[in-house]
């Protein structure tokens, strides 16, 4: 989980300001699958790439969100970008961190955890990353992973690196991250829960 979200975010971040505006306008009229609602216009037009990714995944979940994003990109004439997005969402995930049992490949696809649902917003808005790392060290993160995250220069890049490990995490690993977030930045968790 999180791979499709990454791919959506990468695609949207590669759009120019004008292209992103055009993407949002097309999103307001693109045909939707039955049972899916439309992101409200007022909220949509003011979003940056991070917020829009978060909203796409919360409204449409990862698989359909990526498909919808690719459809809009194609409609804009950005066939290559749409192809890259779809290719990226079909790649396999990495190995599990030490001490964490990866789910068997035959397992049913688990539901979307808060951590996955709000990945983009967490990357953008978490400030107390060092505290999170200390809380997760030895439980979820190996020493190598811990050092790799700490080596990143900014909070968003630290969080992006941290999220590069989450596809291999199980539900309880994600819960430990969420617990740490609730303890260090409760207002952020509460705000995202309301969104």
């Amino acid at each position: 989980m999180g791979r499709a979200r990454d791919a959506i975010l990468d695609a949207l971040e590669n759009l120019t300001a004008e292209e992103l505006k055009k993407f949002k306008l097309k999103l307001l009229s693109v045909p939707l699958r039955e049972g899916y609602g439309r992101i409200p216009r007022g909220a949509l037009l003011s979003m940056d790439a991070l917020d829009l990714t978060d909203k796409l995944v919360s409204f449409y979940l990862e698989t359909y969100g990526a498909e919808l994003t690719a459809n809009v990109l194609r409609d804009m004439g950005l066939q290559e970008m749409a192809g890259q997005l779809q290719a990226a969402t079909h790649q396999g995930s990495g190995a599990a961190p030490a001490g964490i049992q990866a789910p068997p490949q035959s397992a049913a696809k688990p539901g979307l955890h808060f951590i996955d649902q709000h990945r983009a917003a967490l990357i953008a808005r978490v400030t107390n990353v060092e505290w999170l790392l200390d809380a997760l060290y030895g439980k979820v993160l190996t020493d190598e992973q811990y050092q790799a995250v700490r080596a990143e220069p900014t909070n968003p890049s630290k969080m992006r690196k941290l999220f590069s490990f989450t596809p291999a995490w199980n539900w309880t690993c994600k819960d430990l991250l969420l617990q740490a977030l609730r303890e260090s930045q409760s207002y952020l968790v509460e705000d995202l829960e309301r969104s």
Epitope: Q101, P103, A107, A108, K109, P110, G111, L112, H113, F114, Q117, N170, W171, T172, C173, K174, D175, L176, L178, Q179, R182, E183, S186, V189, E190, E193
Partner: antibody, heavy 122, light 107 residues
Framework: EVQLVQSGAEVKKPGESLKISCKIS????????IHWVHQMPGKGLEWMGY????????MYNEKFQGQVTISADKSISTAYLQWSSLKASDTAMYYC???????????????WGQGTLVTVSS | EIVLTQSPATLSLSPGERATLSCHAS??????LSWYQQKPGQAPRLLIY???NLHTGIPARFSGSGSGTDFTLTISSLEPEDFAVYYC?????????FGQGTKLEIK
């Protein structure tokens, strides 16, 4: 309608093994955590841990870690709590419970089984 | 482990009166607190979650408030069926913990 139906009362001797169950219906079993809560006679509630059937990962209260095992069988939408060697102090009511919603891990228990009374006595 | 302390241990009131139950957390739990009602021989029932949200199907006479370390469950006008044991539970961190309970009895 969400339903959690637990197995019947058990009377066991110290040292015996036991596995109690919680059969779930009314929602997708793999999308929600199932928790176990312990209540000794005339006492308060104590959270033991949970299983997330989607990936079979479990979280335990350290007090119960190594004392019990929480598991699930996706094919029959059933969660289990088991002991390999019961003690007299394990005598209690055991409830399975499902949160209001799991994605944010705010574990407010909106749905409960009827409870399984376990009595351990020589 | 976060310890929740409920007070009073027992509260004796009459139907129609207002009941105020307290729950104190040993450390800051923000708004991650819920309240349950339990009657003899029954499983607990969720009343309030996230400090002040009323669970579906729960009468409006129940309300919750508080944040940080101090929380209150209020029953505005007691009905005969409200006499039971009430527990608070924190969802801030593991292990999840419950208070020891407040027994609400008929005076």
């Amino acid at each position: 309608e969400v339903q959690l139906v637990q197995s019947g009362a058990e009377v066991k001797k110290p040292g015996e093994s036991l596995k109690i169950s919680c059969k779930i219906s009314g929602y997708s079993f793999t999308d929600q955590t199932i928790h176990w809560v312990h209540q000794m006679p005339g006492k308060g509630l104590e959270w033991m841990g949970y299983i997330y059937p989607g990936d079979s990962s479990a979280m335990y209260n350290e007090k119960f870690q190594g004392q019990v095992t929480i598991s699930a069988d996706k094919s029959i939408s059933t969660a289990y709590l088991q002991w390999s060697s019961l003690k007299a102090s394990d005598t209690a009511m055991y409830y399975c419970a499902r949160p209001l919603y799991s994605y944010a891990s705010y574990y407010w228990f909106a749905y409960w089984g009827q409870g399984t009374l376990v009595t351990v006595s020589s | 482990e976060i310890v929740l302390t409920q007070s009073p241990a027992t509260l004796s009131l009459s139907p129609g009166e207002r009941a105020t139950l307290s729950c104190h957390a040993s450390q800051n739990i923000n708004v991650w607190l819920s309240w349950y009602q339990q009657k003899p021989g029954q499983a607990p029932r969720l009343l309030i979650y996230k400090s002040s949200n009323l669970h579906t199907g729960i009468p409006a006479r129940f309300s919750g408030s508080g944040s940080g370390t101090d929380f209150t469950l209020t029953i505005s006008s007691l009905e005969p069926e409200d006499f039971a044991v009430y527990y608070c539970q924190q969802g801030q961190s593991y292990p999840l913990t419950f208070g020891q309970g407040t027994k609400l009895e008929i005076k």
